[in-house]
C-alpha cells in the first residue's frame, strides 16, 4: 500500500484504564503530532480509521464496532469503550487518511484490574497540598466528556479503603474534596467513584490520586547553607585529602529547581586543572523540604590548593546564597632539637 | 509564641449591618480549647462585653453593626492543651448599594453571594445568615432587582427561597433581608446574591438522537412486505455507526442465510447544524416469528425499537 507517515508507538502515552469501566481515548495524532484538529481534517475529507494489535500478538486487526450494546464505538476523534474488558489490552492505532494523505500513530492501552480497596498497578497522579494553609481542594480527575452536563452523577470519595464520611478536616463536595487544614495525616491515596446513567445502564468511573502534604509557601525561605560555616576550619597538610561538605536546606517550593554548586577561585571545578571530584546526596523531609549535600574532594591537596577560595553556592526560586569554606594549611608543629 | 499560623480566604462584607465570624477549625476546635480574638496583631483581645459594638461571643467575633473602618486582619488564637493555632481572617468592608445600578460589580464575591438556579427545575436559593445563638433572626424577606418577591412560583421556607419551574427570567440580583435582635436591639441584615441560570444542557452534541422509531409497535399483516426507516440526527463530524439489530445481532448477520430481513443503504441530508441520517430495515415477508420481537435501531449509544403486532381482528 502507499506510504503512510508512521509516528510509531507513542510510549509517552502509557494509557491505563480500569476493567469494566467506560474509557474515552482521544487519537493522539491531533493532540501531539499534527497541526490541525479533527474537525479540520474531517471537513477536508480525511477519514479516521482505528485498528489494534492484541497483547502478545503481531497481527493488526480492525476494531469491531459492531459489538452488542455498542461496547466499542467511535465519536469524532475519540475511541469509546462502554465498558472495557481485560482483553482489550493492546496497542491501538489511529490512522488519518484519504487517497493522497496518510498519517498514523500507535499507543499502548492497558486494562487494569483493581481490588475492593482500589489497589491496582495503575500509576497514580500526585497532588500536593500545602501544610496548614487554609482550605484546599482536589478535584476528581479525567471525568470530563463522559456524560453531559444535564446528567447529575453520584460521587463517592474514599481515603484508602474508607468512605469519607464525618472526617474531621476532609469534606466531600461533589467532584471536589476539600481539606480544611491539610496535615501530614492526610497523606495517602484518595479515590473518587463517579456513578452516572446512560441509556438505561449505570457506569462507574474510578479515579485514584495520591495526596502528598508539602511545606507551605508561607513558611518558605531562601536556601540555608548549614555547611560550610564559620565554625569549621578545614586545616590540611599538603598530600592529605581535602573533603568539604556543602549542605543546603531548601524549603519545599512547587516547581522550583534547587541547585547547589561549588566554585574554586570563582570558576566551576570542571574549568580548572586540579583533580577534584564532587559527590551529591539528596534527602527529603516528610513535607518534601530538601537537603542537598555536595562533597568536594581533592585526593592529594597541594599547598597551592590550600590557598584557593572554595565557595558553595545554592539557588532556588526563593533566592541565591553563597558561603566560603575556611581552608588553611596546617602549620607544622615546631621541632625541638636537644643539643 | 509557638502558635501555628493559618490564613483564611478574604471575607468581603458590607457596612452598616451585623456580621459575625465563627472561629472553628476542625480538628483543632473539637477538643478542650480556648478561643481569643484580636484585631491587627494587637496584644489586647477583643472585648467580651456584650454591649460593645465589636465583641467576642463564645467562639464568634460579632460586629453590631460592621462599620467601614472595621476592615483589617483579625486573628483568633485557639489554644489547646498542647497546641496553639492562630487563624488570620482578612475582612474588607465596603459600602454597598444593592439598588444603585451605577455601582459596578462587587469585588470578588464569595460563593454564598453567587448562586445558581437550574433551568426547568424546582430549585432554591439560600440566605446565608451565620450568627451566634445570642442573635435571634426574624423571618426572611426576599427581593429581586430591589422589588419584594411575590408570586406563586416562589415560597420562603426558613432560610430558603424555593423557586418552582426555574425560567431564564429568574437570573438577576437578589437580596435576602432579615431583622436580627441582640440584647433587645434590632438590626437589619441584607445579603445580596447574584443568580445565574444554568441551561439544560443537551447531550454535548456527541450523542445521536433517534427521531423515529420511538419504542412502539406497528400493526402489520402476516406475509406483507414492510419497510421501516430509522431517522437519526447527529453532529456534522460524527463517526457514529447506525444500524438495525435483532437479539443483539446485526439483522444482515441474523438473517444471513434467508436474507428475508435486510438493512438498507444509509442516506443523509445535511443541515446547517447537524445531519439527518436514514437507514431502513426491509421485511421482504413478515412471518409469525417476527411478531413481539424488538427490532432495534442503533445510532452510537442511542437505541430505539419497533415491535411488530398482528392487527386486531375485524368482526364487522
Amino acid at each position: 500500500s502507499e506510504r503512510c507517515d508512521d509516528w510509531g508507538l507513542d510510549t509517552m502515552r502509557q494509557i491505563q484504564v480500569f476493567e469494566d469501566e467506560p474509557a474515552r481515548i482521544k487519537c493522539p495524532l491531533f493532540e501531539h503530532f499534527l497541526k490541525f484538529n479533527y474537525s479540520t481534517a474531517h471537513s477536508a475529507g480525511l477519514t479516521l480509521i482505528w485498528y489494534w494489535t492484541r497483547q502478545d500478538r503481531d497481527l493488526e486487526e480492525p476494531i469491531n464496532f459492531r459489538l452488542p450494546e455498542n461496547r466499542i464505538s467511535k465519536e469524532k476523534d475519540v475511541l469509546w469503550f462502554r465498558p472495557t474488558l481485560l482483553n482489550d489490552t493492546g496497542n491501538y492505532t489511529c490512522m488519518l487518511r484519504n487517497t493522497t494523505y496518510c498519517s498514523k500513530v500507535a499507543f499502548p492501552l492497558e486494562v487494569v484490574q483493581k481490588d475492593s480497596c482500589f489497589n491496582s498497578p495503575m500509576k497514580l497522579p500526585v497532588h500536593k497540598l500545602y501544610i496548614e494553609y487554609g482550605i484546599q481542594r482536589i478535584t476528581c480527575p479525567n471525568v470530563d466528556g463522559y456524560f453531559p452536563s444535564s446528567v447529575k452523577p453520584t460521587i463517592t470519595w474514599y481515603m484508602g479503603c474508607y468512605k469519607i464520611q464525618n472526617f474531621n478536616n476532609v469534606i466531600p463536595e461533589g467532584m471536589n474534596l476539600s481539606f480544611l487544614i491539610a496535615l501530614i495525616s492526610n497523606n495517602g491515596n484518595y479515590t473518587c467513584v463517579v456513578t452516572y446513567p446512560e441509556n438505561g445502564r449505570t457506569f462507574h468511573l474510578t479515579r485514584t490520586l495520591t495526596v502528598k502534604v508539602v511545606g507551605s509557601p508561607k513558611n518558605a525561605v531562601p536556601p540555608v547553607i548549614h555547611s560550610p560555616n564559620d565554625h569549621v576550619v578545614y586545616e590540611k597538610e599538603p598530600g592529605e585529602e581535602l573533603l568539604i561538605p556543602c549542605t543546603v536546606y531548601f524549603s519545599f517550593l512547587m516547581d522550583s529547581r534547587n541547585e547547589v554548586w561549588w566554585t574554586i577561585d570563582g570558576k566551576k571545578p570542571d574549568d580548572i586543572t586540579i583533580d577534584v571530584t564532587i559527590n551529591e546526596s539528596i534527602s527529603h523531609s516528610r513535607t518534601e523540604d530538601e537537603t542537598r549535600t555536595q562533597i568536594l574532594s581533592i585526593k592529594k591537596v597541594t599547598s597551592e590548593d590550600l590557598k584557593r577560595s572554595y565557595v558553595c553556592h545554592a539557588r532556588s526560586a526563593k533566592g541565591e546564597v553563597a558561603k566560603a569554606a575556611k581552608v588553611k594549611q596546617k602549620v607544622p608543629a615546631p621541632r625541638y632539637t636537644v643539643e | 509564641d509557638g502558635c501555628k499560623d493559618i490564613f483564611m480566604k478574604n471575607e468581603i462584607l458590607s457596612a452598616s449591618q451585623p456580621f459575625a465570624f465563627n472561629c472553628t477549625f476542625p480538628p483543632i476546635t473539637s477538643g478542650e480549647v480556648s478561643v481569643t480574638w484580636y484585631k491587627n496583631s494587637s496584644k489586647i483581645p477583643v472585648s467580651k462585653i456584650i454591649q460593645s459594638r465589636i465583641h467576642q461571643d463564645e467562639t464568634w467575633i460579632l460586629f453590631l453593626p460592621m462599620e467601614w473602618g472595621d476592615s483589617g486582619v483579625y486573628q483568633c488564637v485557639i489554644k489547646g492543651r498542647d497546641s496553639c493555632h492562630r487563624i488570620h481572617v482578612n475582612l474588607t468592608v465596603f459600602e454597598k448599594h444593592w439598588c444603585d445600578t451605577s455601582i459596578g460589580g462587587l469585588p470578588n464575591l464569595s460563593d454564598e453571594y453567587k448562586q445558581i438556579l437550574h433551568l426547568g427545575k424546582d430549585d432554591s436559593l439560600t440566605c446565608h445568615l451565620h450568627f451566634p445563638k445570642s442573635c435571634v433572626l426574624g423571618p426572611i424577606k426576599w427581593y429581586k432587582d430591589c422589588n419584594e418577591i411575590k408570586g406563586e412560583r416562589f415560597t420562603v421556607l426558613e432560610t430558603r427561597l424555593l423557586v418552582s419551574n426555574v425560567s431564564a427570567e429568574d437570573r438577576g440580583n437578589y437580596a435576602c433581608q432579615a431583622i436580627l435582635t441582640h440584647s433587645g436591639k434590632q438590626y437589619e441584615v441584607l445579603n445580596g446574591i447574584t443568580v445565574s441560570i444554568t441551561e439544560r444542557a443537551g447531550y454535548g452534541g456527541s450523542v445521536p438522537k433517534i427521531i423515529y422509531p420511538k419504542n412502539h409497535s406497528i400493526e402489520v399483516q402476516l406475509g406483507t412486505t414492510l419497510i421501516v426507516d430509522c431517522n437519526v440526527t447527529d453532529t456534522k463530524d460524527n463517526t457514529n455507526l447506525r444500524c438495525w439489530r435483532v437479539n443483539n445481532t446485526l439483522v444482515d448477520d441474523y438473517y444471513d442465510e434467508s436474507k428475508r430481513i435486510r438493512e438498507g443503504v444509509e442516506t443523509h441530508v445535511s443541515f446547517r447544524e447537524h445531519n439527518l441520517y436514514t437507514v431502513n430495515i426491509t421485511f421482504l415477508e413478515v412471518k409469525m416469528e417476527d411478531y413481539g420481537l424488538p427490532f432495534m435501531c442503533h445510532a452510537g449509544v442511542s437505541t430505539a425499537y419497533i415491535i411488530l403486532q398482528l392487527p386486531a381482528p375485524d368482526f364487522r
Epitope: - | K121, D122, S124, E152, T155, L157, E158, L162, S164, N165
Partner: antibody
Framework: EVQLVESGGGLVQPGRSLRLSCAAS????????MHWVRQTPGKGLEWVSV????????AYSDSVKGRFTISRDNAKNSLYLQMNSLGTEDTALYYC???????????WGQGTLVTVSS | EIVLTQSPATLSLSPGERATLSCRAS??????LAWYQQKPGQAPRLLIY???NRATDIPARFSGSGSGTDFTLTISGLEPEDFAVYFC?????????FGGGTKVEIK
Amino acid sequence: EVQLVESGGGLVQPGRSLRLSCAASGFTFDDYAMHWVRQTPGKGLEWVSVISWNSDVIAYSDSVKGRFTISRDNAKNSLYLQMNSLGTEDTALYYCAKGHNWNFFDYWGQGTLVTVSS
Amino acid sequence: EIVLTQSPATLSLSPGERATLSCRASQSVSSYLAWYQQKPGQAPRLLIYNVANRATDIPARFSGSGSGTDFTLTISGLEPEDFAVYFCQQRSNWPLTFGGGTKVEIK
C-alpha cells in the same frame, strides 16, 4: 404516564428499622422535589419529609426528625425513606409524592403499609 | 406549625347540588393552599393549587377561592364521582400540614 410505585413496607417490631423505596417513571425525575406523606385512620394525612432535586434541601416533620432519613438516586429514578427506631405511632400507609410548585403534591403512589407492632 | 381546620366534617348533598367546603388556617398562608380529593382505597388527587388554580385534567366545576386564613372549595354541581373526602394543605411554612378532611356523601 406518571407512575410512582412504593415498596418496602411490612410488619416490623418497635425499635427496628425499615427502608421504603419509590420507583418513579413518566417524568423527568431529577427536575422535581419529592416527598413522603403518611396517612393513618386516626391522624389523617401527615407530611413526613421532602428532598430537593439535587438533595440540597431536605426537611422533616418534627415527629420523625432524627429517626428518618430521606434520600434519592436520580440515576435510578428512585426515592428512599430509611426509618429507624420505629414506634407504634409510625404505623401508617406511606405515600411517595411528586412535588408541584415544590410543596404541593400532583402525583401520588398507591402507598405501602407499614405496621409497627410487637 | 400551621393548623388547618376544615368544616363541616361531613356534608350530605344530592347529585347536582352545590358543595361549599371551608378551610381555615391558624395563621396566614398567603395564597399557598391546595385542595385534594381522596376516594376509598385510592391515593389523594390534586384538584386545586395556589388557592384557585385547577390542576391538570380537573373539571371546571371545581373552583377555589380565599386568601390569608379563610379558603373555600366549591363544587358547582355534584357528579356521582365527586362523593369523596376532601383535604386542604398549606405550603407556606414547614412542616407542610393538611386539614382533617371533609367527607362529601350522598344524601
